[in-house]
Amino acid sequence: AGVFELQIHSFGPGPGGAPRSPYSARGPCRLFFRVCLKPGLSEEAAESPCALGAALSARGPVYTEQPEAPAPDLPLPNGLLQVPFRDAWPGTFSLIIETWREELGDQIGGPAWSLLARVTRRRRLAAGGPWAGDIQRAGAWELRFSYRARCELPAVGTACTRLCRPRSASRCGPGLRPCAPLEDECEAPPVCRAGCSLEHGFCEQPGECRCLEGWTGPLCMVPVSTSSCLGLRGPSSTTTGCLVPGPGPCDGNPCANGGSCSETPGSFECTCPRGFYGLRCEVSGVTCADGPCFNGGLCVGGADPDSAYICHCPPGFQGSNCEKRVDRCSLQPCRNGGLCLDLGHALRCRCRAGFAGPRCEHDLNDCAGRACANGGTCVEGGGAHRCSCALGFGGRDCRERADPCAARPCAHGGRCYAHFSGLVCACAPGYMGARCEFPVHPDGVSALPAAPPGLRPGDPQRYPHHHHHHHH
């Protein structure tokens, strides 16, 4: 157990010019700060709860806004921000500091809050060390602060996991040694035998493993047998070394939220961690005064410890403390493979090539709404579109006049004539076919099946229009 402490030194415009004034000139204001601690160094920290704890500063002195003047360093609240932690100090953590402005005008619903700046930094810090100073930029603002983590006795060490006894103690309990005369505070517990149960064993000398009542074995992992023990709950038998563990009031630990249980005559008592109270530590002691709502959430109720608070979250956030960002893109509003972007104030779709529209719903390559001019027809395929144009027209949309004879379609010297229903080839002597592609044998017999009845070699060959499409 221990306390993380944060001292804000200054908050104001950074070097290189004053930021755009955040002041609204609607009346007096004051600053306050929120600190949020999260374990580890994850980039995802901003979207997770403040698992190590959070705290809210007092309000700073009231100041009057001056929109035209450059923003000076703003007046700060007095005192430290303190975040108690119950378990081990993790060493690596994410530190989030929010600077809030409270407008004290006559707004409906009380003072208006607005977030001026938020800095998020991942840090390594050993408990018990000196104050660490830092300067961080948030946009054009600059925040100067110091922080440290300190253990609360009997916990000591860089992670607050070692326990100690005051030097005045004449005798130590399980796992604790008297403090050495020359040691500043206390001495670490001895190293027990390897494998000695952390829950049921302890040692007073290095390398030993002594068992708590009800447990036995070289590593204190074996519950004592009930067959040859005393029938009453009481001290361990000197002959068998075992104990009949009757149904004690602390069995199963009835204390919630990390509370520790101690037996009282005929009952139990829970020692609750900070922030919880009640017979079983089941009631949260957090009130709206503690600022439990993150990301601009509005706290309602909770004026005293006996009433709960409710956080009304702003758009884009959820959770009992508004600590979770709503993944509005999870509904997959963008079609055709578009990328959903959450801009905070709105969602936007970034479309793949070939698609458009607010939700990428328009396929720029399909035939929907695509007119092919001059009697052309739209043909879809392969994620693209093309116009199959009527005779005499070409281009992407069949808007260009096309000369059907421009490609010299008549073979072997045949002459091409444009015709309203298609092109016509007049073949040179000795050739026949729609494009004059077939030679005529000297005996007048075609090398291919005979010409249709009534068609003599040398007659013009009409090229039906349905064979002639310009594809672009």
Partner: antibody
């Protein structure tokens, strides 16, 4: 401080496959707030976006290169990779990897220092 | 694909000058445009995002404006370290496309 570092061979033969890896340090590649992109710059010329990948594997490519481009991600190693097949001299460039923020406002805020890949026999 | 054009392609200026670079998109891109500075042998660095938002740590002499198809990067008072090539990037639609660049050198 986030850092990106490109690595891979500096010389590739024509018609072969160019392979590069970008290693991300100082931050997690598995964040939901970022895409991870590849951009290239031929000597003396401008910048061209190649493609981007999300930690879950969702990919966007530049259609001008799509048939030749493959981008993959390895979250366990905090890396993402680029493969460009059938390379020609026109693929000679400095290749950069970069992080693109996709929440709030979109932009490439962190870049690797770049690695020159020459395509030559 | 959305085409981006920049003008001028190069310019010569002196320390203390006010410099303006323009970027034009072939279709409307709202304000989804960034400006990047690149020095020889270095990776590009973000200056402005969302057309007008100054990236943290970038000097306030840099500013951006515009929306739709026409955008401007302004350096209010050119400093020696500002001689570089500047690129605009549209991130409105895929494929993301850069402008051809504007080289700012010493007069």
């Amino acid at each position: 401080q986030l850092q990106l570092q490109e690595s891979g061979p500096g010389l590739v033969k024509p018609s072969e496959t160019l392979s590069l890896t970008c290693t991300v340090s100082g931050g997690s590649i598995s964040s939901s707030s970022y895409y991870w992109g590849w951009i290239r710059q031929p000597p003396g010329k401008g910048l061209e976006w190649i493609g981007s990948i999300y930690y879950s594997g969702n990919i966007y490519h530049n259609p001008s290169l799509k048939s030749r481009v493959s981008i993959s991600v390895d979250t366990s190693k905090n890396q993402f990779s680029l493969r460009l097949s059938s390379v020609t001299a026109a693929d000679t460039a400095v290749y950069y990897c970069a992080r693109e923020i996709i929440v709030g406002a979109t932009h490439f805020d962190y870049w690797g220092q770049g690695t020159l890949v020459t395509v030559s026999s | 694909a959305i085409q981006m054009t920049q003008s001028p392609s190069s310019l010569s200026a002196s320390v203390g000058d006010r410099v303006t670079i323009t970027c034009r998109a072939s279709q409307g891109i709202r304000n989804d445009l960034g400006w990047y500075q690149q020095k020889p042998g270095k990776a590009p660095e973000l200056l402005i995002y969302a057309a007008s938002s100054l990236q943290s740590g970038v000097p306030s002499r840099f500013s951006g404006s515009g929306s739709g198809t026409d955008f401007t990067l302004t350096i209010s008072s050119l400093q020696p370290e500002d001689f570089a090539t500047y690129y605009c990037l549209q991130d409105y639609n895929y494929p993301l496309t850069f402008g051809p660049g504007t080289k700012v050198d010493i007069k």
